[in-house]
């Protein structure tokens, strides 16, 4: 039966679609030809297209596809985005709230030991932000650098105040001291091992979020096949080539093509879902000493009670001290005077009231209750892709690659397609490079996220409050504790419930596609807004 | 492999000084503290005190002024002495190494122990 | 000072079971705790350091816990060499002190 002849017999809708695409009509036959030049849209009969066309099909059809790609993942891509840069805004300011914490403890309990122990204390919680960001720096190194920094401070100002000036030359002797005699005892190893843990988990948090996004962008980026451009123009422009410019490719042909295009992005399947669920099993961990918040907002209470027992075991010491370092004769040391207002950010010990309460730990939870909602992500990419594209409902008279037809079958269609392109070698060619690329570093960080020791996800008790403490107990697990009894000091029972000093007033609506991050306003007091609540098909 | 062997009298007299050795092999003394614990007949262990890698010592407060810990870190040998015995100090005595290095200048729980020293004192 | 109470006094089991012991601190110890065996004329082994983690070459069915200020031990299986007496210590601050101890004897 002979192909039905091009409606228009002067290709004339043909002309003026293709001349959006490309101006002028050079390249475009003023009658139907027969087209035995062209690669992609081989005709059954005359046709309106030539080989320059066809290029330029297959060019736009990529480009298509990229599009439809990046608008596909947009809504994921800025998801994580913002939540990175919050949560990396939200750390610093935590770590700076610990460091006001302390040094106003300084102040308010041993003001003779300022302003050295500023300079320390700040020292101490430079290197915190850095190791958080990723800084290659040693958690035991800088607790114990602090321990060493504050003690010579202690010697000569609270134990032995009555040293005479050319007794303050014995820096290096009482920091040796200071090791030898455990003159904290075990308030180092007990800090240690509660700052490790809690920050090696933020930055590990971190770390997955900003791989989130290479993921995203990596995904988004993608350059496609000649062999998919030439599979996409088949179904989206070679029914022009007939003049048949209002049908609609199939449904389950678009769903064919796109699995054979997408064959390498699915591949990160298994894997994304397994970021997703490991990120899961990571902040459903974070909490009590694995929840940096928790650890450093209470460190200004430990560090107290380290000093305390220095001052308990005085007596002892002194003397063990006076005969350790009775001849150094080290360099004088002379810390310069900084006014003390210069280390305590005031706004920040204001109690802040906050209306919407919201903890970072909820704000945790929420970000992986929205991830959790993309798990299927890249699997539902391709039906995704050809929702948000032009198809026939029901496979119902619509464009199969070839011709049109009055219902779609998808072996008719393969047949068909073997002597153009094999749809098979397509998908056995494998993931590109770049796709290999992040699936190595997505694997990577799942081991790490996996092998993060960490309590194994979170039963709260009933009399237990939202994070999971009880008024003067540890709740389950001694190993979850913050130490520190604090007598006589502020207790910082709710975490910074602030974000306040981090308002992003984002709608998702108004965001672009990009990587524009958000930036906290100067307000005082203010809470997180939502992210609007974008509903996609891929959820 | 790790050893700590130690070397005393097993007979005491009363008010008399008690010393005993405790020589160290397989780990520097320079990197591990070595207490002193004791076991008195049918009863449970008794923590006497400690001397760190860096030659600070601890003592348990009740021992304090007749109890002296030192060492020597060339011969990998650890030296107690305890005065003033009495009846009641009849007991196993115990050397025991933890973990002392320049890591966390803590505390930390004693992984190596000595064969025990079964201190009598009697006249 | 702390002191370490150690329960029971002692206890009688068969090889297989499983047994518990368990540690209550005076204060906050912060899981600063050791377990040790102590077999029948010898010295004392270290089973358990920081509440939960266990000493090198001990066998996987013995197992450290901790809650608050109470610490437990747990041993699954019993087995023959497993029954002497079962000491706490703490060493989270000088003095450092044991527990009673929990002899475990076979039924």
């Known amino acids: 039966q002979p192909p039905p002849p091009p409606p228009d017999a002067t290709c004339h809708q043909v002309r003026s679609f293709f001349q959006r695409l490309q101006p002028g009509l050079k390249w475009v036959p003023e009658t139907p030809v027969p087209g035995s030049d062209l690669q992609v849209c081989l005709p059954k009969g005359p046709t309106c297209c030539s080989r320059k066309m066809e290029e330029k099909y297959q060019l736009t059809a990529r480009l298509n596809m990229e599009q439809l790609l990046q608008s596909a993942s947009m809504e994921l891509k800025f998801l994580i985005i913002q939540n990175a840069a919050v949560f990396q805004e939200a750390f610093e300011i935590v770590v700076r709230h610990a460091k006001n914490y302390t040094n106003a403890m300084f102040k308010n309990n041993y003001p003779s030991l300022t302003p050295q122990a500023f300079e320390f204390v700040g020292e101490f919680f430079t290197d915190v932000s850095l190791y958080i960001l990723g800084s290659d720096i040693n958690v035991d190194d800088m607790v114990n650098e602090l321990f060493d920094s504050l003690f010579p401070v202690i010697y000569t100002q609270l134990m032995n105040p009555g040293l005479p000036d050319s007794a303050l030359d014995i820096n290096e002797c009482l920091r040796g001291a200071r090791r030898d005699l455990k003159v904290f005892g075990n308030f180092p190893k007990l800090i240690m091992t509660q700052v490790s843990k809690s920050l090696q988990v933020t930055r590990i948090f971190l770390q997955a979020l900003n791989l989130g996004i290479e993921v995203i962008n990596t995904t988004d980026h993608l350059k496609f096949s000649k062999d998919c451009g030439r599979m996409l123009t088949r179904m989206w422009y070679c029914s022009y080539c007939q003049g048949l410019m209002m049908v609609k490719p199939c449904g389950g042909y678009c769903n064919v093509v796109m699995q054979g295009c997408m064959a390498g992005v699915v591949e990160i399947d298994k894997y994304w879902r397994e970021y997703i669920l490991s990120l899961e099993e990571l902040v459903n961990g974070m909490y009590r000493i694995y929840d940096m918040e928790n650890v450093l907002l209470g460190l200004f209470s430990t560090i107290h009670d380290s000093i305390q027992y220095v001052q308990k075991n005085a007596g002892k010491l002194t003397t063990t001290i006076g005969k350790l370092c009775a001849h150094s004769q080290q360099r004088q040391y002379r810390s310069a005077y900084y006014p003390e207002d210069l280390f305590i950010d005031k706004k920040v010990l204001k109690v802040a009231h906050v209306e919407h309460e919201e903890t970072l730990s909820s704000r945790r939870r929420e970000l992986i209750q929205k991830l959790k909602s993309f798990i299927s992500f890249y699997s539902a990419l391709p039906g995704y892709i050809c929702s948000h594209s032009p198809v026939a409902e029901n496979d119902t008279l619509c464009w199969n690659g070839q011709e049109l037809v009055e219902r779609y079958s998808q072996k008719a269609a393969r047949n068909g397609m073997k002597n153009q392109f094999n749809l098979h070698e397509l998908k056995m060619k494998g993931p590109e490079p770049v796709v290999s690329q992040i699936i190595d570093k997505l694997k990577h960080i799942n081991q790490l996220l996996r092998t993060m020791s960490m309590p194994k996800g979170r039963v709260l008790d009933k009399n237990l409050d939202e994070e999971g403490f009880e008024s003067g107990d540890c709740g389950d697990d001694e190993d979850e504790c913050i130490g520190g009894s604090g007598d006589g000091m502020i207790k910082v029972k709710n975490q910074l419930r602030f974000l306040a000093e981090l308002a992003y007033d984002l709608d998702v609506d108004d965001a672009p596609g990009n990587s524009q991050q958000a930036t906290p306003k100067d307000n005082e007091i203010s809470t997180f807004h939502n992210l609007g609540n974008v509903h996609s098909p891929l959820k | 492999q790790v050893q700590l062997k130690q070397s005393g009298p097993g007979l005491v007299q009363p008010s008399q000084s008690l010393s005993i050795t405790c020589t160290v092999s397989g780990f520097s003394l320079n990197n591990y503290g070595i207490n002193w614990v004791r076991q008195s007949p049918g009863k449970g262990l008794e923590w006497l005190g400690v001397?760190?890698?860096?030659?600070?010592?601890d003592y348990n407060a009740p021992f304090i002024s007749r109890l002296s810990i030192s060492k020597d870190n060339s011969k990998s040998q650890v030296f107690f002495k305890m005065s003033s015995l009495q009846v009641d100090d009849t007991a196993i005595y115990y050397c025991a190494g933890n973990p002392d290095s320049d890591h966390y200048y803590g505390y930390e729980a004693m992984d190596y122990w000595g064969q025990g020293t079964s201190v009598t004192v009697s006249s | 000072d702390f002191q370490m109470t150690q329960s029971p006094a002692s206890l009688s089991a068969s090889v297989g079971e499983t047994v518990t012991f368990t540690c209550r601190a005076s204060?906050?110890?912060?899981?600063?705790l050791a377990w040790y065996q102590q077999r029948q004329g010898k010295s004392p082994q270290l089973l358990v350091y920081?509440?939960?983690t266990l000493a090198d070459g001990v066998p996987s069915r013995f197992s450290g816990s901790a809650s608050g200020t109470q610490y437990s031990l747990k041993i699954i299986s019993l087995q023959p060499e497993d029954f002497g007496t079962y000491y706490c210590?703490?060493?989270?601050?000088?003095?450092?002190?044991f527990g009673s101890g929990t002899k475990l004897e076979i039924k």
């Open positions: 920081n509440a939960k």
């Open positions: 210590q703490h060493f989270w601050t000088i003095p450092f002190t």
């Open positions: 001397v760190w890698s860096g030659g600070g010592t």
């Open positions: 204060g906050d110890i912060h899981n600063f």
